[in-house]
Structures are given as structure tokens and as C-alpha cells.
């Protein structure tokens, strides 16, 4: 799982009279904050669904796993989790599902440590450039980020502004190249239309790329090439119609890749000989028994594996002049 | 500039109920948050409540918690405060704001309606 996870079985909980203590100094070895339970022995924090409506100021020290999931937080300013001192074994950050809107740039300094983080099931309308590196410098600090979660932070559609969604998370991952050690990313439901062309070049050391449930209809102007690492790449349940030559010859260039492509709405028309030759041959596709026509209708469920190029024709497009109305 | 108008308030037995209702002009995007606040003579105001138009997040003071609920309409560009079990310290002036931040001061709005009187009787 990608969620920080903690063994602990016993935490204790905040003190009441802690429950208006906002003090500058630092945090009692043991202190909890109000609305959460803690565990040293696990180095773990726990403050869910207690509608926080922001981070706690006394975070103790030792938090190494810190859940803040199901709250009301609304906004994570600069700094929100600087401290002196610095939560410097802050490894693991859940923050799904805490009706978070806007992530200002920064939002993240001060966590050395920090390997996972989780923003899923936020509705992100607003999420700076500089969320991840913290700095508008074109080259920033390495963050020390391998895991990012970005599972359906897509906000309402009406809601987006006429911004270009893809284009701020986008921006975000990419900004002063602070992200080159992740590993992991996972973009899944988000209503995805395009990759930006860019974007996984420079990622160099993706391991895992999550795609799944967007709405992908071509993959024409991205490469893999660069993605020598890469071993999962989920695209399943979007709107790919074919793979073309490019791509596929990428794919398979990979030496350690699985690429899930179940529940897309393939187009069976002379398009998509390559891919079928391919999928015959290809180790690298999970599932690829399963994957089937949808389009033309006179195709539609047929397995990709069993057709062969006789099946596979395109209506002839008939010259201007022998068109009739 | 936007234009909030309130509406809903009046004269209530105490432990009744009242629905105040905040209609902006139109949506205001530069605004995130859209608050109640309230006055009475001679105070501050108050922060009641606020909710964010995009995720909805709420947010309440202490003494409201449980017995007011603050929701929206981002449809009709409308706010509401929900206030049940009411006391006679909750009467007062209430306000409708419109905000950039997160915020529960008085200086973190910009834009203010002119304001609905509730009155509690005990």
C-alpha cells in the first residue's frame, strides 16, 4: 500500500487541557496534540477524521508516520509543517481526503525526510507550482520525495477556472527539477485528456506511473524512453483507441516494465495491426487476453489476441468526386 | 467588488431555529471562502463560521459547534447559516463576508454584506 501504515496498537491520547495550547516553544517529548493519538513506540501520529481545520502546532518530535486524513484543513500555507524544531523524521504524510483546495508553494520545507506523501481525494484547484520544490528557482534542492499520491485531486469542473489541469500538476512536478528521485507517482482518476509531452522525461527515476481512470485517448507525443526504471505502468479505464509503432517499440525498449491496459475502448480498424502483432509477441502486457474491441460495432468484444489482419479494415475513403449526397 | 446581501433573520424563542441565507451578486472566484461573522453594540465581530466554495471545508468557533451548520449553493452563488438551539447571547448583527484566506479575523475578508438582525428571546 502506499499509505503510511503503523504497527502500533496503543496511542494515547491528547490531554483535554492541551486542547487550546498553541505554543511557540517546542512540543513535550510525549506532548500529543488535541484531536489526535500518538505512539512513540510506532513514531506515529493519528488525527483523522476530527475536522481539523489546520495542521497542529505541537506535532512531537519523534513523528515519523503522520495521518491527517479526513479533516477540513482547506488550505496548506508555506511552512505548514516547519518547526523548531524541524519534524526532522517526518518520513510518511497522508493528507487524503481533507478538503483541501490550496496548496501554497512551500507547503512542504522543513521535512528532510519526507519519502511519501499523500494528497488523494483532495479537490486541488489550486496548487502552486512550487507546492513540491518550494523555491521559483529554475533548479531547486533535490526534494527528498520518492513517493507522490495524487489520486483523484481533480476539482469539479466548474470549478477549474478555464485552467488547463493537466498543465498545473504538471507544473508542479516539475518545477526546478526538484522531483528527479521519485519513484512512484500516481495520477489515477483525474479526468486526464493528454500527458504533457515533457513531463516524464524529466522524472528519470519512476519506477511506478499510475495513469489509470483518466480520460487518455492517445499516447502518440509521450515517451517512455527516457524511463529506463520504470516496471508498472497502469493505464487501464481510459479512452485509448491504439498504440501506435512509437510507443509500442518504447514499451517494449524497458527492460523491467508490466503496462496494464485493460478497459480502454480500442478501435479495431487497420490501425491497430501493429498493436495486435505486438500484443502476440509482447511479455510486457498484463492481462492481455483480456483486452477487447469496441469499436466498429461489428467488432465489438472480439479479443485483440484473436484477430488476425484480415479482420482488421478500414472503410475506404472515397475521392471527392465519387461521393454522393 | 462583490455584493453580498443577508437575509433570514428576526425574532426567536430561544431553543428555536433560524436559516439565514447569503447571496452574492455573483461568483466571487478571487474569494475562496465566504464567512458569518457577528456584532453586538459596543463589541468586535465575531467569527461564526466559514466554508470554502471549491472543497467545502467548514469551520466553526467553539461556542456554535453542534447547534449552527454553515453550507452553500454554488449554483445560485448562496451561503447559508443554519442556526438551531439558539440562546439569548446569540443575538446579534449577523454578517457575510467574503474572503482569500482561511481565516477566522475580521481583516481576512474583504467584502461584507450589510447585515441581518437575530434576536433571542429567553
Known amino acids: 500500500s502506499s499509505s503510511p501504515t503503523s504497527s502500533a496498537s496503543s496511542f494515547s491520547s491528547s490531554a483535554p487541557f492541551l486542547a487550546s495550547a498553541v505554543s511557540a516553544q517546542p512540543p513535550l517529548p510525549d506532548q500529543c496534540p488535541a484531536l489526535c493519538e500518538c505512539s512513540e513506540a510506532a513514531r506515529t501520529v493519528k488525527c483523522v477524521n476530527r475536522n481539523l481545520t489546520e495542521v497542529p502546532t505541537d506535532l512531537p518530535a519523534y513523528v515519523r508516520n503522520l495521518f491527517l486524513t479526513g479533516n477540513q484543513l482547506a488550505v496548506l500555507p508555506a511552512g505548514a509543517f516547519a518547526r523548531r524544531p524541524p519534524l526532522a523524521e517526518l518520513a510518511a504524510l497522508n493528507l487524503s481526503g481533507s478538503r483541501l483546495d490550496e496548496v501554497r508553494a512551500g507547503a512542504f520545507e522543513h521535512l528532510p525526510s519526507l519519502r511519501q506523501l499523500d494528497l488523494s481525494h483532495n479537490p486541488l484547484a489550486d496548487l502552486s507550482p512550487f507546492a513540491f520544490s518550494g523555491s521559483n528557482a529554475s533548479v531547486s534542492a533535490p526534494s527528498p520525495l520518492v513517493e507522490l499520491i495524487l489520486n483523484h485531486i481533480v476539482p469539479p469542473e466548474d470549478e477549474r477556472q478555464n485552467r488547463s489541469f493537466e498543465g498545473m500538476v504538471v507544473a508542479a512536478l516539475l518545477a526546478g527539477r526538484a522531483l528527479q528521485g521519485l519513484r512512484r507517482l500516481e495520477l489515477a482518476s483525474n479526468h486526464f485528456l493528454y500527458l504533457p509531452r515533457d513531463v516524464l522525461a524529466q522524472l528519470p527515476s519512476l519506477r511506478h506511473l499510475d495513469l489509470s481512470n483518466n480520460s487518455l485517448v492517445s499516447l502518440t507525443y509521450v515517451s517512455f524512453r527516457n524511463l529506463t526504471h520504470l516496471e508498472s505502468l497502469h493505464l487501464e479505464d481510459n479512452a485509448l483507441k491504439v498504440l501506435h509503432n512509437g510507443t509500442l517499440a518504447e514499451l517494449q525498449g524497458l527492460p523491467h516494465i508490466r503496462v496494464f491496459l485493460d478497459n480502454n475502448p480500442w478501435v479495431c480498424d487497420c490501425h491497430m495491426a501493429d498493436m495486435v502483432t505486438w500484443l502476440k509477441e509482447t511479455e510486457v502486457v498484463q492481462g492481455k487476453d483480456r483486452l477487447t474491441c469496441a469499436y466498429p460495432e461489428k467488432m465489438r468484444n472480439r479479443v485483440l489476441l484473436e484477430l488476425n489482419s484480415a479482420d482488421l479494415d478500414c472503410d475506404p475513403i472515397l475521392p471527392p468526386s465519387l461521393q454522393t449526397s | 467588488q462583490v455584493q453580498l446581501q443577508e437575509s433570514g433573520g428576526g425574532l426567536v424563542q430561544a431553543g428555536g431555529s433560524l436559516r439565514l441565507s447569503c447571496a452574492a451578486s455573483?461568483?466571487?472566484?478571487?474569494?475562496?471562502?465566504m464567512a458569518w461573522f457577528r456584532q453586538t453594540p459596543g463589541k468586535e465581530r465575531e467569527f461564526v463560521a466559514a466554508?470554502?466554495?471549491?472543497?467545502?471545508?467548514?469551520r466553526y468557533t467553539d461556542s456554535v459547534k453542534g447547534r449552527f451548520s454553515i453550507s452553500k449553493d454554488n449554483a445560485i452563488n448562496t451561503v447559508y447559516l443554519q442556526t438551531n438551539s439558539l440562546k439569548s447571547e446569540d443575538t446579534a448583527v449577523y454578517y457575510c463576508?467574503?474572503?482569500?484566506?482561511?481565516?477566522?479575523?475580521?481583516?481576512?475578508?474583504?467584502?461584507w454584506g450589510q447585515g441581518t438582525l437575530v434576536t433571542v428571546k429567553p
Open positions: 463576508a467574503a474572503g482569500q484566506t482561511w481565516g477566522t479575523k475580521f481583516t481576512d475578508y474583504s467584502d
Open positions: 455573483r461568483r466571487p472566484f478571487s474569494s475562496k471562502t
Open positions: 466554508v470554502r466554495w471549491i472543497g467545502g471545508a467548514t
